[in-house]
């Protein structure tokens, strides 16, 4: 009996540019002889319904149809037919099929590969055209994929023990697609600093499928001047 097992749940998520290993394990009732078996990996794009051969291994012959694709013969002996793809790109997401032949038996398994890119986040202060005591803080999130993203603003006042979500005076622009397929978006918070308590911490909170925990960028209102420090104006921080 020949059986193939892929990633549990049927989906693998990998960061953009990562060296990804797409799992495929072979279960066979006898010891595997790699000279008399075959492995073929196929890929089906998210946009086209056409299957493309990525890699094949037959006895003493192996060929990568995608540059850098490899199945380790050494690991194959112990039943690991996982495919390694260096520098994975967004357009390489889709369905991967691992087909194993141990004559006369054949088994296969499929897995969905999702490629994600984590956003970078930075805060900027824009005082151009603003009234006195009015500031506009911009939270720029860039280089993320997929497009779905959630940006919120929160504040933590001195006296209260937990943050408060801000819903007023927040405008989040449309997402903009970059040349590389990733996305950018900017969210703006308008503050009347004269009405806010010094010591209040404001935070732009970015939630995205690529992040285990939200990305946070903050600034604190000071009594002297309600603004970001010079380093905060230009640096990325989370």
């Amino acid at each position: 009996d020949l059986k193939v097992e892929m990633m549990a749940g049927g989906t693998q998520i990998t960061p953009l540019n990562d060296n990804v290993t797409i799992f495929c394990n072979i279960f066979y009732s006898q010891p595997l002889n790699i000279t008399s078996m075959g492995i073929t990996w196929f890929w089906k794009s998210l946009t086209f319904d056409k299957e493309v051969k990525v890699f094949e291994f037959f006895g003493d012959h192996q060929e990568a149809f995608r540059p850098g694709a490899i199945v380790s013969p050494w690991r194959l002996k112990s039943g690991d037919a996982s495919l390694r793809l260096p520098g994975i790109q967004l357009e390489e997401a889709g369905e991967y099929r691992c087909e194993v032949v141990v004559t006369p038996l054949k088994a296969q398994g499929t897995v969905q590969l999702e490629v994600v890119a984590s956003p970078a986040s930075r805060l900027l202060l824009d005082q151009v055209g603003m009234k006195e005591n009015e500031d506009k803080y911009m939270c720029e999130s860039s280089g993320f994929y997929p497009e779905a993203i959630n940006i919120t603003w929160e504040k933590q006042t001195q006296k209260f023990p937990h943050p408060i979500e801000i819903s007023e005076d927040v405008i989040t622009g449309p997402t903009i697609k970059n040349m590389d397929g990733t996305f950018n978006v900017t969210s703006c918070l308008k503050l009347n600093s004269s009405q806010e308590d010094p010591g209040t911490v404001y935070q732009c909170v970015v939630r995205h499928a690529s992040l285990h925990t939200p990305l946070r960028s903050n600034f604190t209102l000071t009594a002297a001047r309600h603004s970001l420090s010079e380093t905060e104006k230009t640096d990325n921080f989370s």
Epitope: E154, Q158, P161, P163, V201
Partner: antibody, heavy 117, light 107 residues
Framework: QVQLVQSGAEVKKPGASVKVSCKAS????????MNWMKQAPGQGLEWMGG????????DYNEKFKGRVTMTVDTSTSTVYMELSSLRSEDTAVYYC??????????WGQGTLVTVSS | DIQMTQSPSSLSASVGDRVTITCKAS??????VAWYQQKPGKAPKSLIY???NRYDGVPSRFSGSGSGTDFTLTISSLQPEDFTTYYC?????????FGAGTKLEIK
């Protein structure tokens, strides 16, 4: 990292006073507000009051007003909560706590005050 | 003062169960509600703020929902370490007030 270390357990007689301390470290002391909570044995949590750590502002729960005093010693980064005219229902664990800047609020380990004749 | 009425006061469940604890505020508190977990002899630990936002490091099995006067804390799949006491807290105004607590026990 932020630490709030409270003074040890106290046993007091009814009518006496108790002063519990909370020493803070790991952050700029004066730029925060410190709250005090009470938790009687097997009971829920109750806010007693709070103090701004530069010492210029306090806010007390009406229930404890007149009996509770909160003070600050900025030189030692220590906050004090004094409760006077103690009665048996004041037997509780007292906690100092401050906001956590997005990572959950910070709490001291608690101080058990037992009021018994 | 704003009263926070928490229910049930105790709850028996098994590992893997999904449980929901509710909290009702005596007046509109918006989303200014936090949830705490307290283990015996320890200080409370914040789980949720702004009714539904998990603090960093809090397992995803904990989720909060609600706004206005009705709030819930849900634990999607109970783990052995979750059997302890939970409190809700409003922080829209002083005095800060808490629910009376829900003790979660192993069935």
């Amino acid at each position: 990292q932020v630490q709030l270390v409270q003074s040890g357990a106290e046993v007091k007689k009814p009518g006496a006073s108790v002063k519990v301390s909370c020493k803070a470290s790991g952050y700029t002391f004066t730029s925060y507000w410190m709250n005090w909570m009470k938790q009687a044995p097997g009971q829920g949590l109750e806010w007693m009051g709070g103090i701004y750590l530069n010492g210029d502002s306090t806010d007390y729960n009406e229930k404890f007003k007149g009996r509770v005093t909160m003070t600050v010693d900025t030189s030692t980064s220590t906050v004090y909560m004094e409760l006077s005219s103690l009665r048996s229902e004041d037997t509780a664990v007292y906690y100092c706590t401050r906001r956590g800047d997005y990572f959950g609020d910070f709490w001291g380990q608690g101080t058990l005050v037992t009021v018994s004749s | 003062d704003i009263q926070m009425t928490q229910s049930p006061s105790s709850l028996s469940a098994s590992v893997g169960d999904r449980v929901t604890i509710t909290c009702k505020a005596s007046q509109n508190v918006g989303k200014y509600v936090a949830w705490y977990q307290q283990k015996p002899g320890k200080a409370p630990k914040s789980l949720i703020y702004s009714a539904s936002n998990r603090y960093d490091g809090v397992p995803s099995r904990f989720s909060g929902s609600g706004s206005g006067t009705d709030f819930t804390l849900t634990i999607s799949s109970l783990q052995p370490e979750d059997f302890t006491t939970y409190y809700c807290q409003q922080y829209i105004s002083y005095p800060l007030t808490f629910g009376a607590g829900t003790k979660l026990e192993i069935k």
